[in-house]
C-alpha cells in the first residue's frame, strides 16, 4: 500500500509535471506568428485510455516529438528550452510510470494537434491530483 | 519556516528597467515553481508569469511577452524578474509566489519621470 | 483566457455575521480555485485551494463549496481580523487568473 510521503511525492511530480505542460501551452498560445499554423500541422498520438499513471507511457513516447515540433518555436519571446524542458518531463514521468512492469501503449485512431494533446495530458494530470487529494 | 524575501523598493523613468530579486530560504529552492504576480495601487491581482527554478525556463502572460525575463540563481536560491520598458502603468507592488502559496512581501516599483 | 467574476465587489457586515462570496469562471474549472485574504499592505494569504481544502492554520470558520464555473467563499461567523479584501483564483490553466476582488467592511 503506497505510504503518506510515496502519495506525497507522487502528487508532487504530477504537480511539476501538469506546471510543466500548462508553461508549454501558455507559450503556444502566446504565438500570433506563422510559426504557430506549421507547429499545428504536426500530429500527435493520443492515449485510447489514460487514468493511470501507467498510462504515461503513451507520454512518454510522444515526448521527442514533442520536442522537435518546440524546437520550431525557438526565438527571443519562447523561453522554454524544449531540451532542458523535456528532459525535465521526461525524468518526471520515467519516475511516475515506474520501470518494473512493461507497459505497451495503445493509441486512439485519431490524431490531434499539439494543443489537443497537451490539454489532454494536463487534463491527465488534473484528474489523478484531485485523486490524490 | 519557508520565507521569501524580495529586494527594496525602487522608483524608475519611463523607458527604463527594473528588476527584482526573490530569496528563498527554508525549503528546497526547486521544490516549487515560482510565480510573478503584481497589483497596481487600489487594483486586483495580474499575474506575470511562472518560472520552474530547476529547469530556469519561463513563460509570462501575453501581456508581459517581449517586455518580462524570469531568471534564477540555484547558488543563492533566488529568482529575478526584470521589466523593461518601463511605463506609469507599472507602478505596482510586483510579489514572488512559490507555488501561489508563499508569497514574498512584495516590492514596490514606481514609474515617474 | 478564463475571466473570474466576483461578486459582490464590497459588502458591509457585523462581527458575528455569516458571510459569502461569489466567483464565476468563464468557462469550466473543474474545483481548481483558491480563495486569498489581503490586508492593506500585505501579501495575499492562501485560505483555501481545490475549492474546499483549507491551507493548514487557516480557521474553520472559512470554507470553499463549488465546481465547474460556480463557486462560494463562506465566513461562518465573522471576526474582527476577517476585515479584508477576499480574491479568487484559477489555475486550471495558464495563465492564472483572479478575480477583481470583494472587500469586506465594518458595518
Known amino acids: 500500500a503506497p505510504t503518506s510521503s510515496s502519495t506525497k511525492k507522487t502528487q508532487l511530480q504530477l504537480e511539476h509535471l501538469l506546471l510543466d505542460l500548462q508553461m508549454i501551452l501558455n507559450g503556444i498560445n502566446n504565438y500570433k506568428n506563422p510559426k504557430l499554423t506549421r507547429m499545428l500541422t504536426f500530429k500527435f498520438y493520443m492515449p485510447k485510455k489514460a487514468t493511470e499513471l501507467k498510462h504515461l507511457q503513451c507520454l512518454e513516447e510522444e515526448l521527442k516529438p514533442l520536442e522537435e515540433v518546440l524546437n520550431l518555436a525557438q526565438s527571443k519571446n519562447f523561453h522554454l528550452r524544449p531540451r532542458d524542458l523535456i528532459s525535465n518531463i521526461n525524468v518526471i514521468v520515467l519516475e511516475l510510470k515506474g520501470s518494473e512492469t512493461t507497459f505497451m501503449c495503445e493509441y486512439a485512431d485519431e490524431t490531434a494537434t499539439i494543443v489537443e494533446f497537451l490539454n489532454r495530458w494536463i487534463t491527465f494530470c488534473q484528474s489523478i491530483i484531485s485523486t490524490l487529494t | 519556516q519557508v520565507q521569501l524575501v524580495q529586494s527594496g523598493a525602487e522608483v524608475k523613468k519611463p523607458g527604463a528597467s527594473v528588476k527584482v530579486s526573490c530569496k528563498a530560504s527554508?525549503?528546497?529552492?526547486?521544490?516549487?515553481?515560482m510565480h510573478w504576480v503584481r497589483q497596481a495601487p487600489g487594483q486586483g491581482l495580474e499575474w506575470m508569469g511562472i518560472?520552474?527554478?530547476?529547469?530556469?525556463?519561463?513563460t509570462y502572460a501575453q501581456k508581459f511577452q517581449g517586455r518580462v525575463t524570469m531568471t534564477r540563481d540555484t547558488s543563492t536560491s533566488t529568482v529575478y524578474m526584470e521589466l523593461s520598458s518601463l511605463r506609469s502603468e507599472d507602478t505596482a507592488v510586483y510579489y514572488c509566489?512559490?507555488?501561489?502559496?508563499?508569497w514574498g512581501q512584495g516590492t514596490l516599483v514606481t514609474v515617474s519621470s | 483566457d478564463i475571466q473570474m467574476t466576483q461578486s459582490p465587489s464590497s459588502l458591509s457586515a457585523s462581527v458575528g455575521d455569516r458571510v459569502t462570496i461569489t466567483c464565476r469562471a468563464s468557462?469550466?474549472?473543474?474545483?481548481?480555485l483558491a480563495w486569498y485574504q489581503q490586508k492593506p499592505g500585505k501579501a495575499p494569504k492562501l485560505l483555501i485551494y481545490a475549492t474546499s481544502t483549507l491551507e493548514s492554520g487557516v480557521p474553520s470558520r472559512f470554507s470553499g463549496s463549488g465546481s465547474g464555473t460556480d463557486f462560494t467563499l463562506t465566513i461562518s461567523s465573522l471576526q474582527p481580523e476577517d476585515f479584508a479584501t477576499y480574491y479568487c483564483q484559477q489555475s486550471y490553466r495558464f495563465p492564472v487568473t483572479f478575480g477583481q476582488g470583494t472587500k469586506v467592511e465594518i458595518k
Open positions: 518560472i520552474n527554478p530547476s529547469g530556469g525556463y519561463a
Open positions: 527554508g525549503h528546497t529552492f526547486t521544490r516549487y515553481y
Open positions: 468557462q469550466s474549472i473543474n474545483s481548481w
Open positions: 509566489a512559490s507555488g501561489l502559496f508563499i
